[in-house]
């Protein structure tokens, strides 16, 4: 039997307002509204919390019966829909211990896990997975790309008691591995031996000057020489112009700086590699994954352009149940959502074309009127006469 610690689908109208608490840490936090957005698969089922004010911080949270994930799998799952074509804004959730003062939740409030998509400018389109380990927020060392389209997507984080994890988007695995390998929770297993240093006589030169090579006698020639073909101009006046000096030219016999031939260095020892030792500061931690207490799920976000919808929150210990829940919610409505969006886009295109046609028609009508106005006044004549006179109908 799966343990479901938290589940929120917003299926009871305004009922969510009694379960979710707004932070009062700042007076100008943005407001969440219940909405299924401009397009959806099912108007009722797709209702979720939507950010409604541009350029705001948001801070809203819901509490649940506190639990620990020690010795069991933790699954965090929710859907996010950036229907506003987001430029910069968060779509992630934070899991807090139940000691959090929900009315004072803010960006620096200590959390256990932060997970979900984040988009900001061209440089950030990633899924954050951050664990608070011994008081420090530790970021994943991998780059997990998030979805940046306008549709609803399902994000799932699985953390297992064997210290492995998995990130899924739309019920497909996008990343997995071990917590110790993919985060810097622990000091490195090996470090450079602090007592080792490169021996004085360690020769890292692969090639050396050939000691038997010597510079040829005739090597040193000046780079520039007086032009032997230059002649003093006839009208050169030494008193007026000073002593005549021929212009200089590049010396064809100049050989440049002499460098001895290179030979293999008989004493070459290769590049010195700093020996490593076991790091005395390293000790494995089999309980990296574990937290004593989860009690609050929070949305602590910044959004430049609002419109993001959060829905179908689930915290459980059962991977299969989470996958099933995802398929029964996001899975069921995603196709219809796309259909509705495509239909809207098509209608918009049609409207745009109609508007363009109308505009063109108006322009043609206006041009006709203008031409009539600018033509000379014509006498009332029959068409045949008019044609003979050279009049042409506009």
């Amino acid at each position: 039997e799966p343990a479901v610690y938290f589940k929120e689908q917003f299926l009871d109208g305004d009922g969510w307002t009694s379960r979710w608490i707004e932070s009062k840490h700042k007076s100008d936090f943005g407001k969440f509204v219940l909405s299924s957005g401009k397009f959806y698969g099912d108007e009722e089922k797709d209702k979720g919390l939507q950010t409604s004010q541009d350029a705001r911080f948001y801070a809203l949270s819901a509490s649940f019966e506190p639990f620990s994930n020690k010795g069991q799998t933790l699954v965090v799952q929710f859907t996010v829909k950036h229907e506003q074509n987001i430029d910069c804004g968060g779509g992630y959730v934070k899991l807090f211990p139940n000691s959090l003062d929900q009315t004072d939740m803010h960006g620096d409030s200590e959390y256990n896990i932060m997970f979900g998509p984040d988009i900001c400018g061209p440089g950030t389109k990633k899924v954050h997975v951050i664990f608070n380990y011994k008081g420090k927020n530790v970021l994943i060392n991998k780059d997990i790309r998030c979805k940046d389209d306008e549709f609803t997507h399902l994000y799932t984080l699985i953390v297992r008691p064997d210290n492995t994890y998995e990130v899924k988007i739309d019920n497909s695995q996008v990343e997995s591995g071990s917590l110790e390998d993919d985060w810097d929770f622990l000091p490195p297993k090996k470090i450079k031996d602090p007592d080792a240093s490169k021996p004085e006589d360690w020769d890292e030169r692969a090639k050396i000057d050939d000691p038997t090579d010597s510079k040829p006698e005739d090597w040193d020639k000046p780079e520039h020489i007086p032009d032997p073909d230059a002649k003093k101009p006839e009208d050169w006046d030494e008193e007026m112009d000073g002593e005549w000096e021929p212009p200089v030219i590049q010396n064809p016999e100049y050989k440049g700086e002499w460098k001895p031939r290179q030979i293999d260095n008989p004493d070459y020892k290769g590049t010195w590699i700093h020996p490593e030792i076991d790091n005395p500061e390293y000790s494995p931690d089999p309980s990296i994954y574990a937290y004593d207490n989860f009690g609050v799920l929070g949305l602590d976000l910044w959004q430049v352009k609002s419109g993001t919808i959060f829905d179908n929150f689930l915290i459980t210990n059962d991977e299969a149940y989470a996958e099933e829940f995802g398929n029964e919610t996001w899975g069921v409505t995603k196709a219809a959502e796309k259909q509705m969006k495509d239909k809207q886009d098509e209608e918009q295109r049609t409207r745009r074309m109609m508007r363009t046609k109308m505009r063109m028609r108006r322009m043609r009508r206006t041009r006709r009127k203008m031409r009539r106005k600018m033509s000379p006044a014509r006498p009332r004549t029959s068409c045949r006469e008019a044609c003979l006179q050279g009049w042409t109908e506009a």
């Epitope: 430029d87 950030t124 810097d184 959004q303």
Partner: antibody, heavy 127, light 107 residues
């Protein structure tokens, strides 16, 4: 990579204000957070505040609250730091520094340090 | 407010290893960044997030953070490493710098 070029040296009277500019080039201005750090002669570095141009909101060190205003103009990729009610202790080199914006929260760029610095602007406050 | 403590000066012979410490209350819970500043120049980021090196910074520079001290280690010290070094953290929406350490390369 972004480059930061600051305005020239200033000599100011006590009680007046100074506005230093920091123009970014070679990168997307909205992808960075800009911090202002000052260094009095022979002293260490002191953070004054910062701004994330894409957010438009600034964050100030307690010590300078009410006396410093940090702004950004995205159209010219320029950040500004204005310090008012100048006193002789404000004589320092003022640096702007950028941090890559790796997310949509105030805290993100502070995970990464300030990886590009301007050349510094010397402000002398003297009567 | 949060404070970071650095030794005012550290001296080291060329080729040897220099260690500069940065102490602060529960500093291991912070991400520590290190900057190098040579006379008359702007600071340069040499280590971020405790131990990561920005591109272009030699491998000789490394960092660690455990217990109540973060450490910047410079192995095989060169004359060009002589500079002031500052540690920095982010605490309660504020950037905090250490007082700086002057590294002198002997000889």
């Amino acid at each position: 990579e972004v480059q930061l070029v600051q305005s020239g040296a200033e000599v100011k009277k006590p009680g007046s204000s100074v506005k230093v500019s920091c123009k970014a080039s070679g990168g997307t201005f909205s992808s960075y957070a800009i911090s202002w750090v000052r260094q009095a002669p022979g002293q260490g570095l002191e953070w004054m505040g910062g701004i994330i141009p894409i957010f438009g909101t600034a964050n100030y060190a307690q010590k300078f609250q009410g006396r410093v205003t940090i702004t950004a103009d995205e159209s010219t990729s320029t950040a500004y730091m204005e310090l008012s009610s100048l006193r002789s202790e404000d004589t320092a080199v003022y640096y702007c520094a950028s941090s890559p914006l790796r997310g949509s929260g105030w805290y993100w760029h502070y995970y990464y340090g300030m990886d590009v610095w301007g050349q510094g602007t010397t402000v002398t406050v003297s009567s | 407010s949060y404070e970071l403590t650095q030794p005012p000066s550290v001296s080291v012979a060329p080729g040897k290893t220099a260690r500069i410490t940065c102490g602060g209350n529960n500093i291991r819970a912070k991400h520590v960044h290190w900057y190098q500043q040579k006379p008359g120049q702007s600071p340069v980021l040499v280590i971020y997030q405790d131990s990561k090196r920005p591109s272009g910074i030699p491998e000789r520079f490394s960092g660690s953070n455990s217990g109540s001290t973060a450490t910047l280690t410079i192995s095989r010290v060169e004359a060009g490493d002589e500079a002031d070094y500052y540690c920095q953290v982010w605490d309660s929406s504020t950037v905090v710098f250490g007082g700086g350490t002057k590294l002198t390369v002997l000889g």
